[in-house]
Structure formats: structure tokens, C-alpha cells
């Protein structure tokens, strides 16, 4: 066949769907690769063709659209499973073509099984809620397009294995789940099960997401440098190892980049000639506040090094702060034996 623009296997779109549930999968060509949509392509006389490669096979084969009850069908740029089976797992290709043009992309589809408590290998999206921060809601994700607006589905919410009903603080509101005051105890996996009728059959959509309760923006502060501070003096003799920790607390801030860095005499350590190493460690609280520690280390410090200015800097979306470490050369203690001997006129 003639040349076809092949976008290869799009592993960025690792699609996972539950066994025995409907799935609608849009051809990724129009969403991520081409600059026109399906309607434009269709009206220009282009045809969308689907085929697949079964798991652990190399042979591409056409998709069987003549299964009983139209179990697999295509509608515009969407491939429908009503419902999926475990052996639908494989790599799927959609190809857009006419006599002069061809473009195609493949993507992996994995049909996964879940247990009665909704545990599965499915990768779960994470929804962050601010602690004690007004009423917040999560919405049952990825259910658009499965049924028309005239159909009124039933939605049941679960936390872990338990149906959410009559929880004081968490209230199912149809497609939404309301958290009146989010607390650490609300951390966990939440599942919505959407049940709807179609052509005399009943289908279920299961969607699970992880809720993580994080620090509230109303409690957020600029970075706080705990170390270095005014109470600790780094007093060293030449030849000793100099270790200065820079420990900074960052309030949780959604999408904030937290940064910590040292300057030595106003320059980044990379820009000066002394042999300095910096090691960083990061820890998080239960609400994802962050503590970063950067330890500045000079193995054998010189008297010149002990005269330099060592400043720890920190920055977040809330602001920037800096603190200088108090570094000084240790005054050597008098060597009494020699000095006393000299005092008595000994030679």
C-alpha cells in the first residue's frame, strides 16, 4: 500500500478500562496529532478505519463490527465497546485515509478486572482537597458521552468498600460528592458507580479516584528557614569539614515550585572554584507541606573559606526569603606547655 504517516504507538495514552463495562475511545489522531477534527476530515472525503493487534500477537487484524448486539461499534471518531471483554486488550490503530492521504496512530488498550471493593491495577487520578476549607466537591470523572441528557442515571458513591450514605461530612449529590469540611480522615479512594439503561440493557460505569487532603491556601505562608539561624555558629579550624544545613519549611501550595539554593559570596556554588558539595533531602507532612534540607559541605575548609558569606535562599509562590549562616574561624587555644615554659626562661 502507499505511504502512510505513521505516528507509531502512542504510549502516552495508555487507556485502561474495566471489564464488562461500556467504553468509548476517541481516535487520538484528532485530539493530539492532526490540526483538523473528524467532521472536517469526513466532509473532505476521508475515511476512518480501525484495526487492532491482540495482546502478545504481531498480526494486525480488522475489528469485527458484526458481533452480537453490536458489542463493538464505531460512531464518528469513537470506538465503542458495549461492553468490554478481557480479551479486548491489545493495541488499537485508527487510520484516516483516502486515495491521496493517509495518517495513522496506534494506542494500547488494557481491559482490567476489579474486585468487589473496586481494587484493580487501574492507575487512579488524584484529587486534592484543602483541609478545613469550605465545601469542596469531586465529580464522577469521564462519564460524558455515554448516555444522552434525557437519560437519568443512578449514581452510587463508595469510600473504599463502603457505600457512602448518611456520612455526616461527605454527601453524595448525584454526579458530585460534597465534602463539607475536608479532614485527613477523608483521605482514601472514592468510587462512583453510574448505572444507566440503553436499548433494554443496563450498563454500569465504575470510576475511582484518590482523594488527598492537603494544606489550605488560607494557612499558607512564605517559606520559613529553620536553619541556618542566629543561634548556631559554625566555628571551624582550617582543614576541618564544614557542614551547614539549610532547612526550609514550605506550606502546601497547589502547583507551586519550591526551590532552595545556596550562594557563596553571592554566587551559585557551581560558579566558584572551591570544592563544595550539596546534598538535598525532602520530606512531607500529612497535608503535603514540604521540608527541604540542603546540606552544604566543604571537606577541608580553608581560612579563606571561613571568611566567605554563605546564604541559604528559598522561594515558593508565596515569596522568597534568605538567611546567612554564621561562619567563623575557631581561635586556637593557647598551647600552655610551651608558653609557660618560655615564661620560666626554659630553653
Amino acid at each position: 500500500s502507499e505511504r502512510c504517516d505513521d505516528w507509531g504507538l502512542d504510549t502516552m495514552r495508555q487507556i485502561q478500562v474495566f471489564e464488562d463495562e461500556p467504553a468509548r475511545i476517541k481516535c487520538p489522531l484528532f485530539e493530539h496529532f492532526l490540526k483538523f477534527n473528524y467532521s472536517t476530515a469526513h466532509s473532505a472525503g476521508l475515511t476512518l478505519i480501525w484495526y487492532w493487534t491482540r495482546q502478545d500477537r504481531d498480526l494486525e487484524e480488522p475489528i469485527n463490527f458484526r458481533l452480537p448486539e453490536n458489542r463493538i461499534s464505531k460512531e464518528k471518531d469513537v470506538l465503542w465497546f458495549r461492553p468490554t471483554l478481557l480479551n479486548d486488550t491489545g493495541n488499537y490503530t485508527c487510520m484516516l485515509r483516502n486515495t491521496t492521504y493517509c495518517s495513522k496512530v496506534a494506542f494500547p488498550l488494557e481491559v482490567v478486572q476489579k474486585d468487589s471493593c473496586f481494587n484493580s491495577p487501574m492507575k487512579l487520578p488524584v484529587h486534592k482537597l484543602y483541609i478545613e476549607y469550605g465545601i469542596q466537591r469531586i465529580t464522577c470523572p469521564n462519564v460524558d458521552g455515554y448516555f444522552p441528557s434525557s437519560v437519568k442515571p443512578t449514581i452510587t458513591w463508595y469510600m473504599g468498600c463502603y457505600k457512602i450514605q448518611n456520612f455526616n461530612n461527605v454527601i453524595p449529590e448525584g454526579m458530585n460528592l460534597s465534602f463539607l469540611i475536608a479532614l485527613i480522615s477523608n483521605n482514601g479512594n472514592y468510587t462512583c458507580v453510574v448505572t444507566y439503561p440503553e436499548n433494554g440493557r443496563t450498563f454500569h460505569l465504575t470510576r475511582t479516584l484518590t482523594v488527598k487532603v492537603v494544606g489550605s491556601p488560607k494557612n499558607a505562608v512564605p517559606p520559613v528557614i529553620h536553619s541556618p539561624n542566629d543561634h548556631v555558629v559554625y566555628e571551624k579550624e582550617p582543614g576541618e569539614e564544614l557542614l551547614i544545613p539549610c532547612t526550609v519549611y514550605f506550606s502546601f501550595l497547589m502547583d507551586s515550585r519550591n526551590e532552595v539554593w545556596w550562594t557563596i559570596d553571592g554566587k551559585k556554588p557551581d560558579d566558584i572554584t572551591i570544592d563544595v558539595t550539596i546534598n538535598e533531602s525532602i520530606s512531607h507532612s500529612r497535608t503535603e507541606d514540604e521540608t527541604r534540607t540542603q546540606i552544604l559541605s566543604i571537606k577541608k575548609v580553608t581560612s579563606e573559606d571561613l571568611k566567605r558569606s554563605y546564604v541559604c535562599h528559598a522561594r515558593s509562590a508565596k515569596g522568597e526569603v534568605a538567611k546567612a549562616a554564621k561562619v567563623k574561624q575557631k581561635v586556637p587555644a593557647p598551647r600552655y606547655t610551651v608558653e609557660l615554659a618560655c615564661g620560666f626562661g626554659a630553653t
Epitope: 465545601i135 448518611n166 456520612f167 455526616n168 461530612n169 449529590e173
Partner: antibody
């Protein structure tokens, strides 16, 4: 059937303290938040706050912080509203209301008269 | 705080008339709006939840519509027992707020 029964009308002097009770029956008390709503004579409804009947944690609207307190006696399926240092503007009818996304059941109201 | 404005303040109708009561929110509250009826010397009673969902035991002549900032409570063919004050209430965020009420009275 589900019922919220409040204590009877109260006549108090300014500076005194009043404690209004709300006894729930017909459902599991600790499964639903209990909210308090104030209705001054000839006026609308004002939300005062709520108490989480499972944890006992109270939340107060800004206008009701300080002199107002919500408490529970879980074993008696009862919620309480206490108002300290009563003022003339506290004269109103106070309702308890069960909450589950909205106020689906209300107490009959307790009328508080504050007069010297 | 979210402010709910109800209009009209008073509505005089004859039994058998159909009426619409309005509630406008100062910001979008999705469908997190509920309607209550309060008769003289009684506690409020939930009529409609989440803007348009009916409540069991409430006559079908009561219906609700709207989303975002504009909401309507409709009473199809008012009956004498319907006279009283109607309040809207939002549960979109703290603090919960009520509208000032619409008094439905006999003409």
C-alpha cells in the same frame, strides 16, 4: 417516623444564659449533621452553624462566634444550643435542622424572649 | 458570602393561578439551591432540592428550575394551603445563606 423535638419557649433576662435542646428520633443520630437556624420576629432565616454529630466538632457562622455554643449528648440523640450573656437582639425563634445536602427535617422551633 | 435575592417580596394570587418565584444568587452556585415553604408559626418544609429535584410527599404542582445564578420555583394552580412564605437556600459553600423570602398571599 423522623422527628426533631425542641424544648419549650424561654423567657430570659439580658446577661443570662439559655440552653435549647433538640431531640432526634426515627434515624441514626450520628449519621447526619445538626444545624441551627435563627429567625428573628418578622424576619428571614439565618444559618448559625452546625455540629458534626459523629465527631462532635462544631462550626459557627461568623455572626455566631463567641457567645454561642453547640453541644451533643449522643446517648440521648440530642443536640444543644447554648447562648451566653443574652442580649435583646437574641430574641428570636431558633430551629434545629437535620442536614444532608439540604435541611430535610426541622424542629418545631424554640421561641426565646429576652426582656428585663 | 453568597447573597440570595428573592423576588417579588410579596405575591398576591387567586387560588387556581399559576405562579413563578425567583431567586438570584450573587455568584454561580451550580444547582446547589433548595426551596422551602414556611407557614405562619410553623417550621420550614423542604419543597425542592438541588434546583429541580422533587421531594417525596410534596405535591407535583411544585417544580423548580435553573442553574448557576438564576432559579425559579413554579406552582402550577395554587391551592389555599400553599399560602405562606417561600425561602431559597444555597448549600454551595459556607456559610449557608437563605433568601429574604417571598410571601404568597391571597388576593
Amino acid at each position: 417516623q423522623i422527628q426533631l423535638v425542641q424544648s419549650g419557649p424561654e423567657l430570659k433576662k439580658p446577661g443570662e444564659t439559655v440552653k435549647i435542646s433538640c431531640k432526634a428520633s426515627g434515624y441514626t443520630f450520628t449519621n447526619y449533621g445538626m444545624h441551627w437556624v435563627k429567625q428573628s420576629p418578622g424576619e428571614g432565616l439565618k444559618w448559625m452553624g452546625w455540629i458534626n454529630t459523629y465527631t462532635g466538632e462544631p462550626t459557627y457562622a461568623d455572626d455566631f462566634k463567641g457567645r454561642f455554643g453547640f453541644s451533643l449528648e449522643t446517648s440521648a440523640s440530642s443536640a444543644y444550643l447554648q447562648i451566653n450573656d443574652l442580649k435583646n437582639e437574641d430574641m428570636a425563634t431558633y430551629f434545629c435542622a437535620r442536614y444532608y445536602g439540604n435541611f430535610d427535617y426541622w424542629g418545631q422551633g424554640t421561641t426565646l424572649t429576652v426582656s428585663s | 458570602d453568597i447573597v440570595l435575592t428573592q423576588s417579588p417580596a410579596t405575591l398576591s394570587v387567586t387560588p387556581g393561578d399559576s405562579v413563578s418565584l425567583s431567586c438570584r444568587a450573587s455568584q454561580s452556585i451550580s444547582n446547589n439551591l433548595h426551596w422551602y415553604q414556611q407557614k405562619s408559626h410553623e417550621s420550614p418544609r423542604l419543597l425542592i432540592k438541588y434546583a429541580s429535584q422533587s421531594i417525596s410527599g410534596i405535591p407535583s404542582r411544585f417544580s423548580g428550575s435553573g442553574s448557576g445564578t438564576d432559579f425559579t420555583l413554579s406552582i402550577n394552580s395554587v391551592e389555599t394551603e400553599d399560602f405562606g412564605v417561600y425561602f431559597c437556600q444555597q448549600s454551595h459553600n459556607w456559610p449557608h445563606t437563605f433568601g429574604g423570602g417571598t410571601k404568597l398571599e391571597i388576593k
